[in-house]
C-alpha cells in the first residue's frame, strides 16, 4: 500500500507515534517519506547482507527476521515480511522499540539526513487529524 | 516438513514463453524471500533472482533483467517464474529453493528445453 | 560481482582418502560461504553453511574452514557415496553467486 501523506499521519496518530519520545508526528511522517516514499512494501538491500523493510525501513540485521541475514538479533521479534502489511501496526510497534534504543530517530539515516531540524510540521500541515 | 514442488518438464518452441511454479508446503509462505537458479552443463549454477511473496517485492539478476519474471500466489502457497522470448541459451535446470543466505530448501528442479 | 573460483575442477580420489576443495573469492567475504553436494539429476545438497557449520543431517567427515577469500571443504576420509560435484556460493552480496564446481570421482 502506498499511503497519502495524511492518511499516514492519521494512522501513525492512532497508533501513538504523536510526540512518542519526544518526536513529534511531522517527524515520522517525514521519516516515511525519505525512507519508503510511503510505500508500506518496500524492501532495500544494504551492503552488509541484510535488508531494510516496509515503511520505515527497518533492519533485518537488528529487528526483525528475514531468515537470511546472518547474525541476525531480531529485536522486535517479528519475522520481516510483517513490516510489509498495509497495516502498519507491526511496523509502528518496532520502531517504537527502535526509537526507545538510545539514538532516537538518529537510527533512521533518511530522517538524520533529510527531517533532522527542518520544519517537519510541514508534512502534517493541512491534515484532519 | 519443508517442501518446495516445482512443475514439469517443459519443451517450448524459440520465441515462446513458460511459466515455470514452485509449491511450497511447511512453513509460512510469506516470509522467507523464494530465490530462482539456473543450471545449464558446463555453465555451473547461477543465480537468476528472488521474491518476497508476502510482499510482491522482487530482486533480479542484472543478466536476467527482461528474461525472467516472479510472481507469488500466497492463497496457494506457489511461486511462478516466467521465461520469455524463449531461445536455446534457456534451455537448462531451473530451482526453486528457500532463501535463507543459504539453500537448505531446494524443489527438484525444471527441465526447460527449447527447440525448433 | 563477486567471484568464486574453485581447485582443482577435477579430483580423483580412492575411497579412504582424504581430501581438501578449494574456493577462492575475488573480494573478502567474511564467512558467508556454504558449500553443497550434487549427484546426477539430483538437487544440490547443502553441506556446510557460514564456512564451517555443518548442516543438519551431514556426516561429520565433512568440514568447513576459511574466512575472508580463501576457504577449504574437507572430507576425511572419502565414502564412495561423497563422489559427485561440488559447488560454493556466497551470501555477502547480490547477486549471489556460485563457484564453477569441482568434480569428486574415483579414481
Known amino acids: 500500500k502506498v499511503f497519502g501523506r495524511c492518511e499516514l499521519a492519521a494512522a501513525m496518530k492512532r497508533h501513538g507515534l504523536d510526540n512518542y519520545r519526544g518526536y513529534s508526528l511531522g517527524n515520522w511522517v517525514c521519516a516515511a517519506k525519505f525512507e519508503s516514499n510511503f510505500n508500506t512494501q518496500a524492501t532495500n538491500r544494504n551492503t552488509d547482507g541484510s535488508t531494510d523493510y516496509g515503511i520505515l525501513q527497518i533492519n533485518s540485521r537488528w529487528w526483525c527476521n528475514d531468515g537470511r541475514t546472518p547474525g541476525s538479533r531480531n529485536l522486535c521479534n517479528i519475522p520481516c515480511s510483517a513490516l510489509l502489511s498495509s497495516d502498519i501496526t507491526a511496523s509502528v510497534n518496532c520502531a517504537k522499540k527502535i526509537v526507545s534504543d538510545g539514538n532516537g530517530m538518529n537510527a533512521w539515516v533518511a530522517w538524520r539526513n533529510r527531517c533532522k531540524g527542518t520544519d517537519v510540521q510541514a508534512w502534517i500541515r493541512g491534515c484532519r487529524l | 516438513q519443508v517442501q518446495l514442488q516445482e512443475s514439469g518438464a517443459e519443451v517450448m518452441k524459440p520465441g515462446a514463453s513458460v511459466k515455470i511454479s514452485c509449491k511450497a508446503t511447511?512453513?509460512?509462505?510469506?516470509?522467507?524471500?523464494i530465490e530462482w537458479v539456473k543450471q545449464r552443463p558446463g555453465h555451473g549454477l547461477e543465480w537468476i533472482g528472488e521474491i518476497l511473496p508476502g510482499s510482491g517485492s522482487t530482486y533480479y539478476n542484472e543478466k536476467f533483467k527482461g528474461k525472467a519474471t516472479f510472481t507469488a500466489d500466497t492463497s496457494s502457497n506457489t511461486a511462478y517464474m516466467q521465461l520469455s522470448s524463449l531461445t536455446s541459451e534457456d534451455s537448462a535446470v531451473y530451482y526453486c529453493?528457500?532463501?535463507?543466505?543459504?539453500?537448505?530448501?531446494w524443489g527438484q528442479g525444471t527441465t526447460l528445453t527449447v527447440s525448433s | 560481482d563477486i567471484e568464486l573460483t574453485q581447485s582443482p575442477a577435477t579430483l580423483s580420489v580412492t575411497p579412504g582418502d582424504s581430501v581438501s576443495l578449494s574456493c577462492r573469492a575475488s573480494?573478502?567475504?567474511?564467512?558467508?560461504l556454504h558449500w553443497y553436494q550434487q549427484k546426477s539429476h539430483e538437487s544440490p545438497r547443502l553441506l556446510i553453511k557460514y564456512a564451517s557449520q555443518r548442516a543438519s543431517g551431514i556426516p561429520s567427515r565433512f568440514s568447513g574452514s576459511g574466512s575472508g577469500t580463501d576457504f577449504t571443504l574437507s572430507i576425511n576420509s572419502v565414502e564412495t557415496e561423497d563422489f559427485g560435484m561440488y559447488f560454493c556460493q556466497q551470501s555477502n552480496s547480490w547477486p549471489r553467486t556460485f563457484g564453477g564446481g569441482t568434480k569428486l570421482e574415483i579414481k
Open positions: 573480494q573478502s567475504i567474511s564467512n558467508n
Open positions: 511447511g512453513y509460512t509462505f510469506t516470509t522467507y524471500w
Open positions: 529453493a528457500r532463501g535463507d543466505g543459504f539453500y537448505y530448501y
